[in-house]
């Protein structure tokens, strides 16, 4: 039975040209994480394999950095980076857990304005 839960950073916004950390955390399970895949819509951005380490898509090599931890850092953000991101945790013996993050990339002034009036 799958008892674990994925906690994510949820819906986040960031400035165009800036960077953002996408984070997921698997809790409430003792299952062993064998691999974490990071996907944007239907595109595979990166893999972190428990034995063989990080692998980054050649298309994103210059803008994606592994970590911190099992998270992913997106750099030099553009408006086209707006959208859904998924962390897919492959575990043994539980199976697959998926977390969703929505990223909105805003023009600099809009991001600043939004931050000033953010409701906690």
């Amino acid at each position: 039975m799958m008892t674990g839960t994925i906690e994510t950073t949820g819906n986040i916004s960031a400035e165009k040209g800036g960077s953002i950390i996408l984070q997921c955390h698997l809790s409430s399970t003792t299952a062993q994480v064998t691999q974490v895949n990071w996907e944007q819509q239907d595109q595979l951005l990166a893999i972190c394999n428990a034995d063989l380490g990080w692998h980054i898509s050649p298309s994103f090599k210059d803008r994606v950095a592994p970590g911190p931890g099992l998270g992913l850092t997106l750099q030099s953000l553009t408006v086209n980076d707006t959208g859904e991101y998924f962390c897919i945790y492959h575990t043994y013996p539980d199976g697959t857990y998926t977390g969703r993050i929505f990223l909105e990339v805003l023009e600099s002034s809009v991001a600043e304005h939004g931050a000033r009036f953010q409701i906690p």
Epitope: Q35, N37, L44, I47, N49, L52, H90, T96
Partner: antibody
Framework: EVQLVQSGAEVKKPGASVKVSCKAS????????IYWLRQAPGQRLEIIGR????????YFVDKFKNRATITTDTSASTAYMELSSLRSEDTAVYFC??????????WGQGTLVTVSS | DIQLTQSPSFLSASVGDRVTITCKGS??????LVWYQQKPGKAPKLLIY???NLQSGIPSRFSGSGSGTEYTLTISSLQPEDFATYFC????????FGQGTKVEIK
């Protein structure tokens, strides 16, 4: 043209070590990880481990963590894989391969290692 | 890790035949599947990546398809140089290979 050229066949006695080389050409050696894999007779390919020539960092699957060593000589664009404490089950064709993101795009021709007393 | 099972393991065919090789995963492979060709004593050659993308320089008679756990490699009209062993590889969960399919001359 990307090429990976491996060293020749080896015959070793049980308990000995073997070191296989893989010379890369046609691309910037430090920009891609090199993997080592093997295929025993009648078996499927299996991964031994990986090295990032840029920083020398190595990764191994559990099965080979204590017996395999992977190194590079970046000045010679060459990767090496040494396997110690050889036994008959290590008789296999050993391959080096370049990984491009998530899959292997260029491979060496293979090196047959025979372990026999 | 996902286990890949290819079928058939051996296949006898003639020049001009249409050939289909199947690769089945023990779990969803999510289209993260690759096909290689290997000839005796030679380096494996990348044919198809991400299920259906033809690698540069590979003839268009080779094609790939599939989703979920089932994938196929098709050679539309077998040529003399196509007699070889073909194997699949997945990277959705672990990095694993199929056992190979040997295509022989009938």
């Amino acid at each position: 043209e990307v090429q990976l050229v491996q060293s020749g066949a080896e015959v070793k006695k049980p308990g000995a070590s073997v070191k296989v080389s893989c010379k890369a050409s046609g691309y910037t050696f430090t920009e891609h990880s090199i993997y080592w894999l093997r295929q025993a007779p009648g078996q499927r390919l299996e991964i031994i481990g990986r090295i990032d020539p840029k920083n020398g960092r190595t990764y191994f699957v559990d099965k080979f963590k204590n017996r395999a060593t992977i190194t590079t000589d970046t000045s010679a664009s060459t990767a090496y894989m040494e396997l110690s404490s050889l036994r008959s089950e290590d008789t296999a064709v050993y391959f080096c391969a370049r990984i491009d993101g998530f899959y292997f795009d260029f491979w060496g021709q293979g090196t047959l290692v025979t372990v026999s007393s | 890790d996902i286990q890949l099972t290819q079928s058939p393991s051996f296949l006898s065919a003639s020049v001009g035949d249409r050939v289909t090789i199947t690769c089945k995963g023990s779990q969803n492979v999510n289209k993260y599947l690759v096909w290689y060709q290997q000839k005796p004593g030679k380096a494996p050659k990348l044919l198809i990546y991400s299920t259906d993308n033809l690698q540069s320089g590979i003839p268009s008679r080779f094609s790939g398809s599939g989703s979920g756990t089932e994938y196929t490699l098709t050679i539309s009209s077998l040529q003399p140089e196509d007699f070889a062993t073909y194997f699949c590889y997945q990277y959705n969960n672990g990095f694993t290979f199929g056992q190979g399919t040997k295509v022989e001359i009938k």
